[in-house]
Amino acid sequence: VPLDPISVSNSSSQIILKWKPPSDPNGNITHYLVFWERQAEDSELFELDYCLKGLKLPSRTWSPPFESEDSQKHNQSEYEDSAGECCSCPKTDSQILKELEESSFRKTFEDYLHNVVFVPRKTSSGTGAEDPRPSRKRRSLGDVGNVTVAVPTVAAFPNTSSTSVPTSPEEHRPFEKVVNKESLVISGLRHFTGYRIELQACNQDTPEERCSVAAYVSARTMPEAKADDIVGPVTHEIFENNVVHLMWQEPKEPNGLIVLYEVSYRRYGDEELHLCVSRKHFALERGCRLRGLSPGNYSVRIRATSLAGNGSWTEPTYFYVTDYLDVPSNIAK
């Protein structure tokens, strides 16, 4: 198994993957296979109302660049806790002995996996990205080497511009074949999106490819600068009883997903008032309604908040509210 894979993002469309060769390979490592797939955002993000008081905005950070060649495990790999980044303590004698035993066990276990679990598979020629990856069959052996990925379904908002749920994980996943090096720059990725990366070491560069159990690591690309900005005008409609319906377009390709909108409005000469519009409320009304407005000139600005933070405020939109008791009843309904 390739050791200590670390992945970092250096831009909104790239992830850099680095690893170390297996400690005790079976024969010569001829190449590595790197597969990646986009991860759906947690389904609770689509359901929770982040406008509720006391509900903290979800913390989603991208994978920061390397500090040095040896700063391993910047971002969590599967089953790791991401609670904090700490230095490793000096190893005790018992730990060193234990690691030597584990190294010996790993060698034996890899031999076992090679011979018992995996059936060698053929890969088609040509560029990896076009290869639909002929199925690498596994013989059933309980849960050995079996990693399950829970992909949340986004049932509540099927039509909003959010991260889509990937189709069957084994099908048509992009991959790269890496020869003579222990690093890869994965390009052409979506901004501020989590990716699950699978890395295998292979020791036979023939149609009967023999590859190790996969090592897994996760990373998130960096945010795109203006992706959370509301594009297009903020429009309004004035209804009876001085109700103003404000409407705007959801950012087309936000950083992750939009969790809420802030609406800031003020009557000329008065202090600014704020409304928080959740995903659900926006979806229901395509905006929000201001009710009980006193007559006068108003300005309104709106900004979106995504998993990566706030977008920019829109340019102010202006509207005038009349004293509806004094006007004929032909105001737009």
Partner: antibody
């Protein structure tokens, strides 16, 4: 003048289906989310379902999830509630109501009575 | 879901006298933007519900000034300064802060 008129209620046996309609007039129907709210005999009000202005987003009360379907036809200014697998506890007056975010429901229909009985 | 509890459930009042209905929520109704989405509805006998008050204390158009709403957080009150015959019916509080919207059980106001 805003008007909401429900139709389609009646007496139906348990397990059967019924479709309610709500005809809207006097406002731009396609700009508003719409709700169904029900009231069992002698009881309080219970929210049933809501549909967004375009019809693409729908939410249901747990008590009707999987059995009831809310839909709308903006070209006909009409809201619908398809009720399947009806139970005795679905017996109620069903109101359609216009949505105002946070402020609840600013206009209600007169209601249509659904009685589920064998 | 947020539970709304009203009291009293029955309120006999003499014409011209004041009346007060209490509504308590199981969670705070203050939204992140500091607005409180608590509404009051009136349902006269044989009629549909009608909204009287929105956002705790704002009267809907056409609602007589004898109706007033107050409160904050989890405790709210609807007051009628002088009850008139046309006020007979059931009054419901409803919260619009948390999803789904939920109603109180209703308070039946009747004339003594």
């Amino acid at each position: 003048e805003v008007q909401l008129v429900e139709t389609g209620g009646g007496v139906v046996q348990p397990g059967r289906s019924l479709r309610l309609s709500c005809a809207a007039s006097g406002f731009t129907f396609s700009s508003y989310a719409m709700h169904w709210v029900r009231q069992a005999p002698g009881k309080g009000l219970e929210w049933v379902a809501v549909i967004s202005y375009s019809g693409s987003n729908k939410y249901y009360a747990d008590s009707v999830k999987g059995r009831f379907t809310i839909s709308r036809d903006n070209s006909k200014n009409t809201l619908y509630l398809q009720m399947n697998s009806l139970r005795a506890e679905d017996t109620a007056v069903y109101y359609c109501a216009r949505h105002e975010w946070g402020f609840g429901f600013d206009y209600w229909g007169q209601g249509t009575t659904v009685t589920v009985s064998s | 879901d947020v539970v709304m509890t009203q009291s009293p459930l029955s309120l006999p009042v003499t014409l011209g006298q004041p009346a007060s209905i209490s509504c308590r929520s199981s969670e705070s109704l203050v939204y992140g933007d500091e607005n409180t989405y608590l509404n009051w509805f009136q349902q006269r006998p044989g009629q549909s519900p009608r909204r009287l008050i929105y956002k705790v204390s704002n009267r809907d158009s056409g609602v007589p000034s004898r109706f007033s709403g107050s409160g904050s957080g989890t405790d709210f009150t609807l007051k009628i300064s002088r009850v008139e015959a046309e006020d007979v019916g059931v009054y419901y509080c409803m919260q619009g802060t948390h999803w789904p919207y939920t109603f109180g059980q209703g308070t039946k106001l009747e004339i003594k």
